[in-house]
């Protein structure tokens, strides 16, 4: 008779997790008798996944019936393959004996498991930054075999081409994963930009998955300050107005101070938003011309979303005609423009620095 | 290792029933055909049926088909044939043997159960 | 069906000596290069034991002293040099069709 050879026809097999895998293993001989016995690996520290005589193999089940006469298919079909299956297995003959002896092996087939990508998570700075400043957004997927796969970074549907990419491990694993950190400068229109970050792989069949970000949770837009003034009134009071514009996110707080005494504070809420995401609002202060001697410095103080106090002050001229009604020279914008000492304390209550 | 469990001696009536056992160890007892031969005092071997225990598949001996029936009990790894109608020539040693190569030979062979049909 | 028949029905060998039992069917055993004879042992109280499958391989643990030959039709089982362990009854079984055995043969030995 001719010498037995145990022939494993795939030197590879790929199945996609939760699939079913077939490891084909046929012997060119019924000599000598003994069993089949499936190892994954080689060497003392081998696997057994099935053993023809012996054992419970839930999830394996032989190709052919065992006891079909003259049996010499000993292929087997391994249920829910998961990553973890992944490895080169080996259909290994047997001779009877007490123990069986082995007698030859086949030449391995090595299991592959496709697994697909988690969605990809994507993550923004921790601390907003403003305009033409740099952030990073990390992107985040796991569990996914084989090891190529590709990522692309976009900006409301632009391609991005500032980010650093690495698969992890960088050797042999049963599954990868990819981190990706992408620097996206910010502009004033950011409020409603998105950043996606785009995952292709060769288990989505085309379809890449998406993770996204919106720019509004990374960015703020400091606002711009300015006074106007309406002409003095019949009763001597001056209403001054102070527009806070183009700022995001809506959390500001404003300080009206005459003469350096806090005469008012508000709390920023329900503002409508503008095209571009931002906000505007617009606080008054009536003033009482004839309660001062002196012309009245008032200052518009405005801190948003923590960041150190923007002042804007005008002067309300007291002396020139004070009764007369729709005189422009009764009020004088001075133009200054201050950001408050960043070295100011936490708590000083003129800043209520922590009102959310 | 394979052992094959069978019951030493059983006496029955004649035109009485007997079910005999062989409680299979060692081995998954789904994967290897189960047969009985039957071997009388002084006499040869004759080979009376098998049974694959994954499926129930049988097979007989024509001169057996009345006779015997063989049945498994997969929870309990146990194959069993019953002999019916017995007569004095049914007094015999009844062996249970499996098939480990799958080539309708017989490997491993219980000790045998000596069946006494007497009145 | 396929009938066997084995001769001698008997025989005696001094120890050492070459004991051959021949297996006849009736019509051949062999199949896709294969030949489906089996021999076993039978010593007195004792289930058989299998000795050689598919006409010449040897079973696990069996002394090289047996040995098998024979296709087709014609079948031979040897014993050399004979020894006192050896002195059982000889079956032939065929597995071409359904299972059958031969008369048996008893071995004796002077």
């Known amino acids: 008779e001719e010498e037995l050879q145990v022939i494993q026809p795939e030197k590879s097999v790929s199945v996609a997790a939760g699939e079913s895998a077939t490891l084909n293993c046929t012997a060119t001989s019924l000599i000598p008798v003994g069993p089949i016995q499936w190892f994954r690996g080689v060497g003392p520290g081998r696997e057994l996944i099935y053993h023809q005589k012996e054992g419970h193999f839930p999830r394996v089940t032989p190709v052919s019936d065992p006891t079909k006469r003259n049996n010499m298919d000993f292929s087997i079909r391994i249920s829910n393959i998961t990553p973890a299956d992944a490895g080169t297995y080996y259909c290994v003959k047997f001779r009877k004996g007490s123990p069986d002896v082995e007698l030859k092996s086949g030449a391995g087939t090595e299991l592959s498991v496709r697994a697909k990508p988690s969605a990809p998570v994507v993550s923004g700075p921790a601390v907003r930054a403003t305009a033409e400043h740099t952030v990073s957004f990390t992107c985040e997927s796991h569990g996914f075999s084989p090891r190529d796969i590709t990522l692309k970074w976009f900006k409301n549907g632009n391609e991005l081409s500032d980010f650093q990419t690495n698969v992890d491990p960088a050797g042999k694993s049963v599954s990868y994963s990819i981190r990706s950190t992408a620097r996206v400068v910010l502009t004033r229109r950011d409020v409603h930009s998105q950043v996606i970050c785009e995952v292709a792989h060769v288990t989505l069949q085309g379809d890449p998955l998406r993770g996204t970000a919106n720019l509004s949770e990374a960015i703020r837009v400091p606002p711009f300050l300015e006074f106007t003034q309406q002409s003095m009134r019949a009763d001597n009071q001056v209403n001054v107005t102070c527009q806070v514009m183009k700022f995001y996110p809506q959390r500001l707080q404003l300080t009206w101070l005459e003469n350096g005494n806090v005469s008012r504070t508000e709390m920023a809420s329900a503002l409508p938003e503008n095209k571009d995401g931002t906000y505007n609002w617009t606080s008054w202060l009536l003033v009482n011309v004839s309660a001062h001697r002196d012309d009245v410095k008032l200052t518009c103080q405005v801190e948003h979303d923590g960041q150190p106090a923007v002042n804007k002050s005008f002067s309300v001229k007291v002396s020139a005609h004070p009764k007369e009604q729709g005189s422009n020279t009764a009020a004088e914008n001075t133009g200054t423009n201050e950001r408050g000492s960043s070295d100011y304390k936490d708590d000083d209550d003129k800043h209520h620095h922590h009102h959310h | 290792q394979v052992q094959l469990q069978q019951p030493g001696t059983e006496l029955v009536r004649p035109g009485a029933s007997v079910k005999l056992s062989c409680k299979a160890s060692g081995y998954t007892f789904t994967n290897y055909w189960i047969n009985w031969v039957k071997q009388r005092p002084g006499q040869g071997l004759e080979w009376i049926a098998m049974?694959?225990?994954?499926?129930?598949?049988?097979h007989y001996n024509q001169i057996f088909k009345d006779k015997a029936t063989l049945t498994v009990d997969k929870s309990s790894n146990t194959a069993y044939m019953q002999l019916s109608s017995l007569t004095s020539g049914d007094s015999a040693v009844y062996y249970c043997?499996?098939?480990?190569?799958?080539?309708?030979?017989?490997?491993?062979w219980g000790r045998g159960t000596s069946v006494t049909v007497s009145s | 069906d396929i009938v066997l028949t084995q001769s001698p029905a008997s025989l005696a060998v001094s120890l050492g000596q070459r004991a051959t039992i021949s297996c006849r069917a009736s019509k051949s055993v062999s199949s896709s290069g294969y030949n489906y004879i089996f021999w076993y042992q039978q010593k007195p109280g004792q289930p058989p034991k299998l000795l050689i499958y598919l006409a010449s391989n040897l079973d696990s643990g069996v002394p090289a002293r047996f040995s098998g030959s024979g296709s087709g039709t014609d079948f031979t089982l040897n014993i050399h040099p004979v020894e006192e362990e050896d002195a059982a009854t000889y079956y032939c079984q065929h597995s071409r069709e359904l299972p059958t055995f031969g008369g048996g043969t008893k071995l004796e030995i002077k």
């Open positions: 049974i694959d225990p994954s499926d129930s598949e049988t």
């Open positions: 043997a499996m098939d480990y190569g799958s080539l309708y030979a017989m490997d491993y």
